[in-house]
Interface confidence: medium
C-alpha cells in the first residue's frame, strides 16, 4: 500500500496548526520543561514500512486523544482545534485505508507490539505530566511543543523508509 | 540570512537535456522542502514538484512527471532539477523556492534560471 | 487540479485610490492555504500575503487580503507608485499545488 501524496502534506499541515496554536512563549515556561522519554528509536527501528504503519497510526490517535479532551478545548483556539482534528482524521483514515488493504493485517510481530506500547507510554507520561501540572498554560506549551518535535521526527522517519522502497 | 542561488541562464539545443541548481545557505537544508516553479516569458506561475531532502522523497505535479527530475546533493547543499527532451514549450525561468509552514511557505526563493531552448 | 482565476488579468490606478484584485478558484480552498505573492519584472516573486489575511514580514499597512471557500481578494486602500507589479494568488489546499494567471497592476 501506498499512502497518498496527501499524506505528506497532511503531515506538514499538522505541524503547522500546532505551530499556530502556541500562545504563550516556551521560554516564559522553562521551569516547567520535561523530558517526557520520547520512543524515537521505535520508529527507527522498523526496517519495512508494514511495521511503522501501526506504530505512525498510534502515534496520531494519541495525539487525537490528547487534543480532544475537555482541558485541551479549554487550553486552545477552537477554530484552530477544530483543523487540527481534520488533519488528524484525514491521516488516520489514510493510514487504516494502508492496514485494510493487507499490510500489518497479519500476524502482529511482538516488536511491533512493544512499539505501539512504548508510544501509549510515553503519552501516558505526558497525561501524567499535565495532571500533575494541573493543566497549566506552560504545561500546555510545553506539551505542545513536545509533539510537535516528536510528530516531526516520526514523521520524517516514516518518510525515510518511504522513499527508500 | 536564507539564500538559494540559481545560475542566471542555460542556452540548450532542442531534443536535450539541462540540469538546474539550486544551491542553499543560512538554514539547515535537510528541514524544508524544496519547491521548483515555472515561469514563461510574460505568463503566471506553474508548481513542477518538491523535494525532501532529508531523505530525497519527491511529489511531482502529473503535467511535468515526464520532463522533471528532482534530486539534492546533501553534502553540496544543492538542489537540481534535470529537464529532458527540451522543446520550445520548455523556454522559461525555472525558479527553486523553499517550503517552510504558515509566514515560511514559499518564502524564500532563488533568482530563477532561464533556459533557452534554441537550435 | 484547482483553477485559480485573476480578475482583472491588467488594471492601472491613480496614487491614492483604492484598490481590489479578486482570484476565483475552481473548487473550495482552505483559507489556511491561500496565498499571495508579488513580482516585479526580472525579480522573483515575494510573500505578499499568507493564510488569505496575513501580512508577510515588511509588507504595507495598506494591503489587506479576505476570502473563504472559492472567493479572495487582495486590496489596497490607497494606492502608491511602490505597489505597480504583478500580483499572484496561490493554493496549497491541494495537490498539485497551483497559481493564478496574475494581475498586472500599473499607476496611472
Known amino acids: 500500500c501506498d499512502l497518498p501524496q496527501t499524506h505528506s502534506l497532511g503531515s506538514r499541515r499538522t505541524l503547522m496548526l500546532l505551530a499556530q496554536m502556541r500562545k504563550i512563549s516556551l521560554f516564559s515556561c522553562l521551569k516547567d520543561r520535561h523530558d517526557f522519554g520520547f520512543p524515537q528509536e521505535e520508529f527507527g527501528n522498523q526496517f519495512q514500512k508494514a511495521e511503522t504503519i501501526p506504530v505512525l497510526h498510534e502515534m496520531i490517535q494519541q495525539i487525537f486523544n490528547l487534543f480532544s479532551t475537555k482541558d485541551s478545548s479549554a487550553a486552545w483556539d477552537e477554530t484552530l482545534l477544530d483543523k487540527f482534528y481534520t488533519e488528524l482524521y484525514q491521516q488516520l483514515n489514510d493510514l487504516e485505508a494502508c492496514v485494510i488493504q493487507g499490510v500489518g493485517v497479519t500476524e502482529t510481530p511482538l516488536m511491533k507490539e512493544d512499539s505501539i506500547l512504548a508510544v501509549r507510554k510515553y503519552f501516558q507520561r505526558i497525561t501524567l505530566y499535565l495532571k500533575e501540572k494541573k493543566y497549566s498554560p506552560c504545561a500546555w506549551e510545553v506539551v505542545r511543543a513536545e509533539i510537535m518535535r516528536s510528530f516531526s521526527l516520526s514523521t520524517n522517519l516514516q518518510e525515510s523508509l518511504r522513499s527508500k522502497e | 540570512q536564507v539564500q538559494l542561488q540559481q545560475p542566471g541562464a542555460e542556452l540548450v539545443k532542442p531534443g536535450a537535456s539541462v540540469k538546474l541548481s539550486c544551491k542553499a545557505s543560512g538554514y539547515t537544508f535537510t528541514n524544508y522542502w524544496m519547491h521548483w516553479v515555472k515561469q514563461r516569458p510574460g505568463q503566471g506561475l506553474e508548481w513542477i514538484g518538491e523535494?525532501?531532502?532529508?531523505?530525497?522523497?519527491?511529489i511531482y505535479n502529473e503535467n511535468f512527471k515526464s520532463k522533471a527530475t528532482l534530486t539534492v546533493d546533501k553534502s553540496s547543499i544543492t538542489a537540481f532539477m534535470q529537464l529532458s527532451s527540451l522543446t520550445s514549450e520548455d523556454s522559461a525561468v525555472y525558479f527553486c523556492?523553499?517550503?517552510?509552514?504558515?509566514?515560511?511557505?514559499?518564502?524564500?526563493w532563488g533568482q530563477g534560471t532561464l533556459v533557452t531552448v534554441s537550435a | 487540479q484547482i483553477v485559480l482565476t485573476q480578475s482583472p488579468a491588467i488594471m492601472s490606478a491613480s496614487p491614492g485610490e483604492k484598490v481590489t484584485l479578486t482570484c476565483s478558484a475552481g473548487s473550495s480552498v482552505d483559507s489556511s492555504y491561500l496565498y499571495w505573492y508579488q513580482q516585479k519584472p526580472g525579480s522573483s516573486p515575494k510573500l505578499w500575503i499568507y493564510?488569505?489575511?496575513n501580512l508577510a514580514s515588511g509588507v504595507p499597512a495598506r494591503f489587506s487580503g479576505s476570502g473563504s471557500g472559492t472567493s479572495y481578494s487582495l486590496t489596497i486602500s490607497s494606492m502608491e507608485a511602490e505597489d505597480a507589479a504583478s500580483y499572484f494568488c496561490?493554493?496549497?489546499?491541494?495537490?498539485?499545488?497551483?497559481f493564478g494567471s496574475g494581475t498586472k497592476l500599473e499607476i496611472k
Open positions: 523556492a523553499r517550503g517552510g509552514l504558515g509566514p515560511a511557505w514559499f518564502a524564500y
Open positions: 496561490h493554493q496549497w489546499s491541494s495537490y498539485p499545488f497551483t
Open positions: 523535494i525532501n531532502p532529508s531523505h530525497g522523497r519527491t
Open positions: 493564510s488569505t489575511s
